[in-house]
């Protein structure tokens, strides 16, 4: 077995169980778990004339280690006296040694339960002049108890002369009383009622409670866009943090993965609002397997102000995948608008949520800022569903009639993409053999019931356009409905709310 | 989540000098404590601080030598072990408590604390 030195405990009675009348007490010391042999008791009895006795070592079975006894006999004026023991292990190193210094007998007592009370706010919610800290200290077995007030954790002048004791049968129970004023409360400071009893300390502690996000200040975590994951592969995550109050503390923003490893350097951005209050971003650059393979990545927000720090984390969504459905439309000509179009295009049925729209003309990705897409919104079963809408001109088109509606999605096969292509004028330019469009025919939401549509926005149908189903003839999925014109011998009538 | 993340521990000779770091996300937490486990002993307490009050305590072996403290900006709290003894050497392990009140009476007891961390191991040679 290798060198290990001794545990060492005191052994003394229970007060109650020695005899008023006692002229002598033996008190003892355990020394135990060390090996080799032999450990060295000496006892300290201060002005007390003692006699020692350390008794053979033994032998522990389990781990053959050993352990021994020394006990120190006193008579006389014992009972308020404090005796150290003092064990050395030279094989440990020439200077172990433990000291344990305790009394002759050990009382039993019950320890207090300290907890601060706290004066309520005013009717109104607000802070009253001054606040009231009650600390109450019950249920202790009677004896000398010692009461101190800390702010933030520095010792408090307070008169202590208001503190009152009472018995309750066998336990008493104390309180004090601290008064502050309102700016010291609504300091932020931390108050602290400290209960000195029997060689120990117990607390309570309180303060202004904070917001759950502290003053008002939010952090927001973003998981990386399809797009950037797997068409660019470099994709980022972003941690914003918004409604900070400027001040001169440094807002600071860590980054940590939940595997330990090391995380790449992230760029920092701060923005002055207008309302005055700061916005600070962070970007952080992932792995694209890391990200793909469901590593977990945390933004720790603190900030000198803060009562403590906000965390947030993001990683890949769980759950089950479905490739989206991809819908492009183009509206009919409106009047009076002949050098412009809107295109629409429906994604939907696809999970997770997390979803890239791009625009594409000539081969080439229109800037996102040309189309507008919402954000995605369940559909009535389990899956999302967007809309994204993009305005193209007359030149556009005549330069060429084919736009195409992309949507990236983690569960899009092969290569994470869906898209379709759309006409403004399909009879012109030959169409495109992935949409087609009904002449004449507007688009309406589904799940609508027969009859007049209901109009976006506020505006109001013509009343002869109804929903009803979609042609045989017209391949779009069958639970679109289309707006029809029924009105014969009048200029066609088109509508381009959604049912 | 809650994660205890210990760091810090390693190969040192006696007399030397360590500082371990107790690294806190997840949760805030009251009071925090620092416990070890030699090997082929139970484990031990070793030292306890209220995020509160500031308040220490400390097991009478290592008084003196260690000093626990806390920045509480960080979620962070640190051990620093000066004068390292061979019986020094341990698996050493950091321990949180959201209970509001604390105490020494109940600070050393591996009850209290109802959030661990994996542990560190000091190495302490002679």
């Known amino acids: 077995a290798s060198t290990q030195s001794p545990s060492v405990f005191p052994l003394t009675r229970c007060c109650k169980n020695i005899p008023s009348n006692a002229t002598s007490v033996t008190l003892g010391c355990l020394a135990t778990g060390y090996f080799p042999e032999p450990v060295m008791v000496t006892w300290d009895t201060g002005s007390l004339n003692g006699t020692t006795m350390t008794l053979p070592a033994t032998t522990l079975t389990l781990s053959g280690h050993y352990a021994t006894i020394s006990l120190l006999t006193v008579s006389g004026a014992w009972a308020k006296q404090m005796f150290t023991c003092r064990v050395a292990h030279t094989p440990s190193s020439t200077d172990w040694v433990d000291n344990k210094t305790f009394s002759v007998c050990s009382r039993d007592f019950t320890p207090p339960t300290v907890k601060i009370l706290q004066s309520s706010c005013d009717g109104g919610g607000h802070f009253p002049p001054t606040i009231q800290l009650l600390c109450l200290v019950s249920g202790y077995t009677p004896g000398t108890i010692n009461i101190t007030w800390l702010e933030d954790g520095q010792v408090m002048d307070v008169d202590l002369s208001t503190a009152s004791t009472t018995q309750e049968g066998e336990l008493a129970s104390t309180q004090s009383e601290l008064t502050l004023s309102q700016k010291h409360w609504l300091s932020d400071r931390t108050y602290t009622c400290q209960v000195t009893y029997q060689g120990h300390t117990f607390e309570d502690s309180t303060k202004k409670c904070a917001d759950s996000n502290p003053r008002g200040v939010s952090a927001y975590l973003s998981r990386p866009s399809p797009f950037d994951l797997f068409i660019r592969k470099s994709p980022t995550i972003t941690c914003l943090v918004v409604d900070l109050a400027p001040s001169k503390g440094t807002v600071n923003l860590t980054w940590s993965r939940a595997s330990g490893k090391p995380v790449n350097h992230s760029t920092r951005k701060e923005e002055k609002q207008r309302n005055g209050t700061l916005t600070v971003t962070s970007t952080l650059p992932v792995g694209t397997r890391d990200w793909i393979e469901g590593e977990t990545y945390q933004c720790r927000v603190t900030h000198p102000h803060l009562p403590r720090a906000l965390m947030r984390s993001t990683t890949k969504t769980s759950g089950p995948r479905a490739a989206p459905e991809v819908y492009a439309f183009a509206t009919p000509e409106w009047p009076g608008s002949r050098d412009k179009r809107t295109l629409a295009c429906l994604i939907q049925n696809f999970m997770p949520e997390d979803i890239s729209v791009q625009w594409l003309h000539n081969e080439v990705q229109l800037p996102d800022a040309r189309h507008s897409t919402t954000q995605p919104r369940k559909t009535k079963g389990s899956g999302f569903f967007v809309f994204s809408r993009l305005e193209v001109t007359r030149a556009e088109w005549e330069q060429k009639d084919e736009f195409i509606c992309r949507a990236v999605h983690e569960a899009a096969s092969p290569s994470q993409t869906v898209q379709r292509a759309v006409s403004v004028n399909p009879g012109l330019a030959g169409g495109s053999a992935q949409s087609q469009r009904a002449p004449d025919r507007v688009l309406c939401h589904s799940g609508q019931q027969q009859g007049l549509p209901r109009a976006a926005g506020g505006s109001v149908p013509h009343p002869r356009c109804h929903c009803g189903a979609g042609r045989a003839d017209w391949p779009g999925p069958p639970e679109l409905d289309v707006c029809v014109e029924e009105a014969e011998g009048e200029a066609p009538w088109t509508w381009t709310g959604l049912c | 989540d809650v994660q205890l993340q210990e760091s810090g521990g390693g190969l040192v000779q006696a007399g030397g000098s360590l500082r371990l770091s107790c690294a806190v996300s997840g949760l805030s937490f009251s009071s925090m404590g620092w416990f070890r486990q030699p090997p082929g002993k139970e484990r031990e307490f070793v030292a306890a601080?209220?995020?509160?009050?500031?308040?220490?305590y400390y097991a009478d072996s290592v008084k003196g030598r260690f000093t626990i403290s806390s920045d509480n900006a960080k979620s962070t709290v640190y051990l620093q072990m000066n004068s390292l003894k061979p019986e020094d050497a341990a698996v050493y392990f950091c321990?949180?408590?959201?209970?509001?009140?604390?105490?020494?009476?109940?600070?050393?007891?591996?009850?209290?604390?109802?959030?661990w961390g994996q542990g560190t191991q000091v190495t302490v040679t002679s």
């Open positions: 321990a949180a408590d959201r209970q509001r009140t604390w105490s020494t009476f109940y600070a050393s007891r591996q009850a209290t604390y109802n959030y």
């Open positions: 601080i209220s995020l509160y009050s500031g308040s220490t």
